[in-house]
């Protein structure tokens, strides 16, 4: 005989991203005997729920809750059962249920009442479900980035913890509700508000980050309908050929369309809008998003936020993938430079309805907002943020990085179930290459 | 209110090409909506043909777009569908309507559903020698 | 092409009783968390019309009885409480992806 040596045990953990739009489940998985090892904790499986958001069931909050059933049975097949009661759940809302909260607390409270009623149902270890702030979106959404590329510490061949020489990769998110952009800084924030100071492996990290509320793609989208129907008979954002029936109570029902919207109007009344394929003034209802006016640090990067110069490489996920990657496949425009990426955003711009479907087949309505997408994320990233060439030439479009999603949901549940300590691991402590 | 009438012949013979056309009162078919055609097959569901928009773009089903043409008539608020090399398969009831992208919100997202809202009373085609 | 499957072919059910259509999607016709689906109800010798739009909201004018529900490839049409006028085959339709595609009906009649 002679022994077989068995697989390392695995531990799991479950996170529901409940998005403005819908709801991701991820399940992410590791070796119990190498849990504070960097870059171990993987994605086992995901699952979207079907719907929308959890913030769409305001009327209805017991839906919020039934609408995750089926990804939670899948939950229940995808971890072995012997796992079940040791698995952590959790359940992280974004800005589409701040918005909600914003607007009518009770019904944001019923909804999470209602979605934690659903998942104390099951046989993991629940851990609670609850409004992430904009600023946790940001670091968490850092973390998951840098974790899974292992630029916290490294495993050396002598058995010992290092910190690598290459920096902090910065990060940049763009939901369908809010936007967040995190990246390590030297200098202290003149901001106290946009500054997080964390300790990871030994290691210690100044972290400017910011989240813009109203920023994310859907809203963008809806204030630019909103200010279209303000300022033109027309949108120049849509396509020649494109034409619809606009609701107006659609139009101005979310907090982020308030400033366009007329002190009296007909919410039920339905206008036509078409479409007029024109870069320029598109270019001009999105420059409108962003003001410029008054700074009161040194310097900002849009509406009187502190920023400072973004600094080192950038990765840009979720939305900013998607628009820049409909760009480059479904498109086949080059986008490697800023001057590129505004080349491609007027291209789009300039397509007809007509043009845009033969050029996409299959597609439908979605086509129609991609030349405000890819307008918003150009004058978003430069005029925004501040990226010149030079530091754009720094910035990977990614969703996912070894073989897991990027966003805010890994780096939350490493947080919260001690994955990544505030020191190294003693036994194994190695020189400090800084 | 807006009203659509299909007219046209009611036999055409195979190989021939089969001409319709849908008169549109009470709207201009150059300020808005998607002008279609569609056909019902007897005893089957609904088959759509395609489209000649506001702007008078065109839009074909790719299971027919070789035999398919859609055009239209502005001073007679007309459109009409071409359908050449017609066989006996092409029987069937066919519709004009109208359609748009009615903007809705789902999930604080704006959403663009394509329906077709006003429709004719149809007009049956027969292909036979 | 998205190909829509409806479910029962025909339905016969008493007045003040509940109606379920069902429509199956070849695959999903979701984006985004919304529902690219509508739903078309066609009298015997009349054209068409529209019920139901983005798989739950109700066309005005359309009686309350009515509902839609679902997401991603399933999705069904509720009468909750079914009236002799209501006899008349339904059509589920797509919109999600080119070229719009309608099931092939389910005919619903009044015992």
């Known amino acids: 005989t002679r022994d077989i040596r068995e697989p390392p045990a695995l531990k799991y953990g479950i996170v529901l991203d409940a998005g403005s739009s819908h709801t991701s489940m991820f399940i992410y998985k590791w070796p119990a005997d190498k849990e504070n090892d960097t870059g171990i904790v993987g994605q086992h499986s995901s699952c979207d729920v079907p719907g929308g958001g959890i913030s769409s069931y305001a009327d209805n909050p017991s839906g919020a809750g039934q609408s995750l059933v089926g990804c939670l049975e899948q939950a229940l097949r995808d971890v072995p059962k012997e796992r079940h009661a040791g698995t952590p759940l959790y359940l992280g809302a974004t800005a589409g249920m701040r918005l909600l909260n914003l607007t009518n607390p009770e019904a944001s409270t019923s909804v999470l009442t209602a979605v934690t009623h659903t998942l104390t149902q099951y046989p993991f270890d629940f851990r609670g479900a609850r409004i992430l702030s904009g600023q946790e979106e940001g670091v968490f959404g850092w973390v998951t980035a840098n974790y899974l590329l292992e630029n916290f510490i490294k495993y050396g061949w002598v058995g010992r913890w290092f910190r690598p020489r290459k920096g902090t990769l910065g990060a940049m998110d763009l939901g369908g509700a809010s936007t967040q952009i995190t990246f390590e800084t030297t200098s202290p924030a003149e901001d106290r508000a946009s500054e997080v100071q964390l300790r990871l492996y030994g290691q210690h990290y100044r972290v400017y980050t910011h989240s813009f509320l109203c920023y994310g793609r859907d809203q963008v989208l809806q204030r630019l309908l909103a200010s279209a129907l303000q300022t033109h008979s027309f949108h120049p954002c849509w396509p020649r050929g494109f034409s619809t029936h606009v609701l107006l109570g659609d139009v101005y029902q979310s907090p982020c369309t308030v400033a366009q919207r007329p002190q009296t109007f007909n919410s039920s009344a339905r206008v036509s809008l078409s479409g007029s394929s024109d870069p320029h003034l598109c270019r001009d209802l999105v420059s409108g998003l962003f003001s410029f006016s008054s700074c009161p640090f040194s310097r900002c990067s849009f509406n009187g936020v502190f920023q400072p110069p973004v600094a080192g490489n950038f990765i840009a996920f979720s939305a900013f993938f998607y628009t820049v990657n409909f760009l480059r496949t479904s498109m086949g425009l080059p986008v490697a430079t800023l001057q590129q990426l505004e080349a491609a955003a007027v291209n789009v711009c300039n397509q007809t309805w007509a043009q845009l479907q033969a050029r996409v087949p299959g597609q439908q309505a979605h086509l129609a907002d991609y030349c405000a997408g890819a307008m918003f994320v150009q004058q978003l990233l430069s005029r925004g943020y501040g990226f010149d060439e030079r530091a754009f030439g720094g910035v990977i479009f990614q969703k996912k990085a070894a073989d897991t999603a990027v966003g805010w949901a890994l780096g939350y549940m490493l947080n919260l179930t001690n994955l990544i300590p505030a020191d190294p691991p003693g036994l194994r402590k190695g020189t400090d290459f800084s | 209110q807006i009203q659509l009438q299909e007219s046209g012949p009611g036999l055409v013979k195979p190989s021939q090409t089969l001409s319709l056309t849908c008169t549109v009162s009470?709207?201009?078919?150059?300020?808005?909506?998607?002008w279609n055609w569609i056909r019902q097959h007897p005893g089957k569901g609904l088959e759509w043909i395609g489209y000649?928009?506001?702007?008078?773009?065109?839009n074909y089903n790719p299971s027919l777009k070789n035999r398919v043409t859609i055009s239209r008539d502005t001073s007679k608020n007309q459109f009409s569908l071409k359908l050449s090399s017609v066989t006996a398969a092409d029987t069937a009831v066919y519709y004009c309507?109208?359609?748009?992208?009615?903007?809705?919100?789902?999930?604080?997202?704006?959403?663009?559903?394509?329906?077709?809202?006003?429709w004719g009373q149809g007009t049956t085609v027969t292909v036979s020698s | 092409e998205t190909v829509l499957t409806q479910s029962p072919a025909t339905l016969s059910v008493s007045p003040g009783e509940r109606a379920t259509i069902s429509c199956k999607a070849s695959q999903s016709v979701d984006y985004d968390g919304n529902s690219y689906m509508n739903w078309y109800q066609q009298k015997p010798g009349q054209a068409p019309r529209l019920l139901i739009y983005a798989a739950s909201n109700l066309e005005s004018g359309i009686p309350a009885r009515f509902s839609g529900s679902g997401s991603g490839t399933d999705f069904t049409l509720t009468i909750s409480s079914v009236e002799p006028e209501d006899a008349a085959t339904y059509y589920c339709?797509?919109?999600?992806?080119?070229?719009?595609?309608f099931g092939g009906g389910t005919k619903l009649e009044i015992k």
């Open positions: 000649i928009s506001y702007d008078a773009d065109n």
């Open positions: 009470g709207y201009s078919i150059t300020s808005g909506y998607y």
């Open positions: 309507a109208g359609g748009y992208y009615r903007y809705g919100l789902g999930s604080y997202r704006g959403s663009y559903y394509y329906v077709m809202d006003y």
């Open positions: 339709q797509q919109s999600n992806e080119d070229p719009p595609t």
